[in-house]
Interface confidence: low
């Protein structure tokens, strides 16, 4: 394992004094209820904290909330509850913070039962001032900001009306009734499902998908018989009832619903589901649930049109009951994803893909670690990491795996070493190369966060007892130092740092409890004096990502190109700084058959990299011929993997087949059609690092 505290470690000198001078305590004059924290804007230092206290009385719930504001990253807070007229704010709606650096905030108030509508408080100056606005409806959901223009808001009412505001919530207009789900699309487009019969719960599968591009002046029904819809990257997905109304199939559009194509995916029955695990403008990871309450399904990866899919991973764990999946995009290295499979023996096992779902392999265990009791062979086993499933099943796992795009190669996760995920107390493991190799960094479960683009990792032990110590590392988790941030331990509730991992401030939240009272308290620690100087050129070293065989000319090639990064040396204790930009040098690789997917009408036989023509088109492929886009029907059987940049090398040029000749009348009758797709096990490669960890794009 990594050197411990007592071994010779590149210690930071005089860190106690430096951190003590930069530790700021704030005690909130508040009854302890719940607390929520939001960052307003990027690099502004503005934090809003909402504390709420509920007193459930016999007839009603009496509530009190307080609003606090900091503009120095949490070192000091000011009570600004009077700006919202001491109103009780509904915590289930949270604080709706505007996109980018708009400085906009919307708080939704609790109103009395008999009122005509709800009430909101709006700020457009980073919460310095608020305007009270009474709504003509009772909101069902949090206000949704248009990604393109933060003045445009969308909300659903408790009566299923769709309401739009064009002046940041000052004036509202109901643009449609009987709306079940609404989402902002691109360029100010609004998509929503509506049921003209009035019910959203009973008639799933009979919904209409509608679109407005002029904020409700006009509408276009872009699809019917809709069960659900989702947006991911450039793709609009609809699951559409088919057959005798018992099956659903995915249809995909890349032009906002003007035209659709059937995705070549298996249809699902009423007890199954589809889920977009990740999507960008180039491709999609789609989970298709297995029939029955199996708890697993199959991951498919799409081509660049979102219509042709290759089988990526079978027995992918995704619970039907709670909807948990361990699928995570490792954002610190292009093309890397981890997830869990449910093995035949019902054990849960971790797998990782370094090539955007082309191949999945077990995680390599740390070199010096011993296999635990789950291992049949004490010498041969792998690392298994805990994610959403472990948390849902109540294991002692306080956090999901963590990675950040600007902390290249760095991954933190709870895990165990064996043949499967263990129910025993997990430890914290760290990878500095995007998941290829791992070290055991900390014993037992911890909360952790990344600061200064990976220059510092901070961790706090997960304990039921009060705590007063944090641990930090300046060398990507190899060596750790401890700092006692308060004499009086606190009951820890959360670790907060500014999103984006560029900050050098960390806030530790918790509460103190004396005989009769409990109070919220926060400690904000600024690490700026630990990293005294700015990093220089000599502090960085060249690192080739995805390197597994330095002798191989194609070493590091993923998705047709390799990337060299400038990375901070582990021995350098310096500031990357807020303006740090990842420096990378890409170089194009030669093409191989692994750079291509099998196109529509083709598949890869087991253990073969060549794409072979399907003997005949099946299922709904005749309508694909007529109502699909024709350019899909002329193919040489191969299609470049989305995002693949390879050039030269293997060029699978062969006779261009015109699949339209198969589009004749000698098809099975509709009654006998089955729509199983013939997934091809194509190799694939990396994404553009745009997914948040554990953010499922769409679950039906």
């Amino acid at each position: 394992s990594a050197p411990g505290e007592d071994e010779e470690c590149g210690r930071v000198r005089d860190f106690v004094a430096k951190l003590a001078n930069n530790t700021h305590q704030h005690v909130f004059d508040d009854l302890r209820g719940s607390v929520s924290l939001s960052w307003v804007g990027d690099s502004t230092g503005v934090i809003l904290v909402l504390t709420t206290f509920h007193v459930p009385l016999v007839i009603m719930t009496f509530g009190q909330s307080k609003l606090y504001r900091s503009e120095d990253y949490g070192k000091n807070f000011k009570d600004i509850t009077d700006l919202i007229n001491n109103t009780f704010i509904r915590t289930e709606f949270g604080m709706a913070i505007g996109p980018e650096n708009s400085g906009k905030v919307v708080l939704t108030a609790e109103v009395s039962g008999g009122s005509r509508g709800g009430r909101i408080f709006r700020s457009s100056d980073f919460a310095k001032n608020f305007v009270q606005t009474d709504l003509p409806f009772h909101p069902l959901t949090q206000m949704m900001y248009s990604p393109q223009n933060s003045d445009y808001l969308l909300a659903l009412s408790t009566e299923n009306g769709l309401w739009v505001s064009k002046n940041f919530g000052g004036k509202w207009e109901e643009i449609h009734k009987t709306v079940c789900l609404a989402k902002w699309g691109r360029k100010g487009t609004i998509f929503f499902t509506a049921n003209h019969n009035g019910s959203c719960s009973n008639d799933r599968g009979m919904l209409e998908l509608e679109r407005t591009t002029d904020y409700g002046k006009s509408f276009k029904t872009v699809a019917s018989k809709i069960y659900s819809f989702g947006l991911g990257g450039k793709f609009l997905f609809a699951s559409v009832m088919t057959g005798k109304g018992t099956l659903r199939a995915i249809h995909v559009s890349v032009d906002d619903g003007d035209t659709w194509n059937m995705a070549q995916l298996p249809p699902v029955g009423h007890e199954q589901f589809y889920s977009i695990l990740a999507a960008n403008d180039e491709m999609v990871f789609m989970h298709v649930d297995e029939p029955g309450d199996s708890g697993f399904g199959t991951i498919y990866v799409s081509d660049d049109r979102g219509t042709v899919y290759s089988k990526s991973l079978e027995r992918h764990l995704y619970t039907t009951t709670g909807g948990e999946t361990d699928f995570i995009n490792v954002t610190s290295l292009r093309g890397v994803f981890t997830t869990s499979i449910l093995a035949e023996d019902k054990s849960v096992q971790s797998v990782i893909s370094f090539d955007q779902g082309g191949e999945w392999v077990p995680l390599r265990k740390p070199a010096d670690s011993k296999c635990d009791a789950t291992a049949r062979d004490p010498e041969k086993c792998s690392l298994h990491i805990h994610a959403a499933y472990s948390i849902a099943t109540g294991l002692n796992v306080p956090m999901l795996p963590l990675s950040e795009p600007n902390a290249v190669g760095l991954v933190l996760a709870h895990g165990s070493v064996g043949d499967a995920i263990s129910v025993m107390r997990p430890d914290v493991y760290v990878s500095d190369d995007g998941g290829y190799t791992w070290i055991k960094a900390l014993e037992g479960p911890h909360y952790y966060t990344i600061l200064d683009s990976g220059g510092i990792i901070v961790a706090i032990e997960h304990s039921s007892r009060p705590i007063n110590v944090i641990k930090f590392s300046t060398d990507e988790g190899q060596c750790w130092q401890t700092y006692t941030f308060t004499r009086d331990p606190i009951y820890f509730t959360g670790l907060a740092s500014e999103p984006g991992a560029r900050s050098m401030n960390i806030s530790i939240w918790g509460f103190t409890e004396s005989f009769l009272t409990s109070q919220w308290v926060s400690y904000t620690i600024d690490f700026k004096d630990i990293l005294e100087r700015n990093c220089e050129e000599k502090d960085y070293t060249i690192w080739l990502a995805h390197s597994t065989d330095p002798e191989d000319y194609e070493d590091g090639c993923i998705l047709g190109y390799k990337e060299q990064f400038l990375r901070l040396r582990k021995s350098s204790v310096c500031q990357n700084g807020r303006d740090y930009v990842v420096t990378k040098q890409p170089s194009i690789c030669l093409c191989s058959l692994e750079d291509f997917l099998c196109d529509f009408g083709y598949y890869r036989p087991e253990n073969d990299s060549k794409c072979v023509e399907q003997p005949e088109l099946k299922g709904h492929d005749l309508e694909f011929c007529l109502y699909g886009r024709e350019e899909h029907l002329t193919t040489n059987g191969y299609r470049k993997i989305p995002g693949d940049k390879c050039q030269g090398g293997v060029n699978p040029v062969r006779e261009v087949k015109d699949l339209k000749k198969k589009c004749t009348s000698n098809f099975l009758s509709p009654e006998k059609q089955n729509s199983k797709s013939n997934g091809s096990a194509g190799g694939s490669g990396g994404l553009n690092d745009i997914f948040e960890a554990q953010k499922i794009e769409w679950h039906e």
């Epitope: 005749l622 007529l626 699909g628 886009r629 024709e630 339209k660 009348s665 009654e671």
Partner: antibody, heavy 118, light 111 residues
Framework: EVQLVESGGDLVKPGGSLKLSCAAS????????MSWVRQTPDKRLEWVAI????????HYPDSVKGRFTISRDNAKNTLYLQMSSLKSEDTAMYYC???????????WGQGTSVTVSS | QAVVTQESALTTSPGETVTLTCRSS?????????ANWVQEKPDHLFTGLIG???NRAPGVPARFSGSLIGDKAALTITGAQTEDEAIYFC??????????FGGGTKLTVLG
């Protein structure tokens, strides 16, 4: 607003030829399969030809196969029906139509009359 | 060749609900037959009402709805109006015959 406007109908002798046109507007013409449908004097509707979005895939019922040719010019948003070796039973009102598959709705033109008579 | 059968004529009164059906000689109509419903009014005025079993065309009043009832495709007019008096044709898609039309239903709305 979607519009389909047919033209080219006429009185023609048996064995003669005629070319019908259909100008489309108000939707992305190049994205949809299009059909010609006719209504005979006894008011029955009969599908006559279908062409896919890009124009390279066509199909016809046996009654007109080999005599009628459907084509399209996506640049001009126009659908065509070339009819040759016309018979008296081809006398009908001819409609250009967007009949619909799974996820769209149908549109029809106002029709153009073809009479085959000596 | 598949044969598509419709009621030859139906009569209803304003405000009533009326259902027109469309049967296939090959067996049950399914959503894979993508039933289209077309309205013909005097002077050869055809309007596409429903596509793909139940997709109402833009501009078509909400009182028109398409569905499957039993083994048939159906067009239901909820609250018929005098201007709904017309001939209604259904068209079914078959993978071997493509589009086949029914003989049409003449709907009379007694004013």
């Amino acid at each position: 607003e979607v519009q389909l406007v047919e033209s080219g109908g006429d009185l023609v002798k048996p064995g003669g030829s005629l070319k019908l046109s259909c100008a489309a507007s108000g939707f992305t013409f190049s994205s949809y399969g299009m059909s010609w449908v006719r209504q005979t004097p006894d008011k029955r509707l009969e599908w006559v030809a279908i062409i896919s979005s890009g124009g390279s895939y066509t199909h016809y019922p046996d009654s007109v196969k080999g005599r009628f040719t459907i084509s399209r010019d996506n640049a001009k948003n126009t659908l065509y029906l070339q009819m040759s070796s016309l018979k008296s039973e081809d006398t009908a009102m001819y409609y250009c139509a967007r009949l619909c598959g799974p996820l769209c709705s149908g549109y029809w033109g106002q029709g153009t009359s073809v009479t085959v008579s000596s | 060749q598949a044969v598509v059968t419709q009621e030859s004529a139906l009569t209803t009164s304003p405000g009533e609900t009326v259902t027109l059906t469309c049967r296939s000689s090959t067996g049950a109509v399914t959503t894979s037959n993508y039933a289209n419903w077309v309205q013909e009014k005097p002077d050869h005025l055809f309007t596409g009402l429903i596509g793909g079993t139940n997709n109402r065309a833009p501009g078509v009043p909400a009182r028109f709805s398409g569905s499957l009832i039993g083994d048939k495709a159906a067009l239901t007019i909820t609250g018929a109006q005098t201007e709904d008096e017309a001939i209604y044709f259904c068209a079914l898609w078959y993978s071997n015959h493509f589009w086949v039309f029914g003989g049409g239903t003449k709907l009379t709305v007694l004013g």
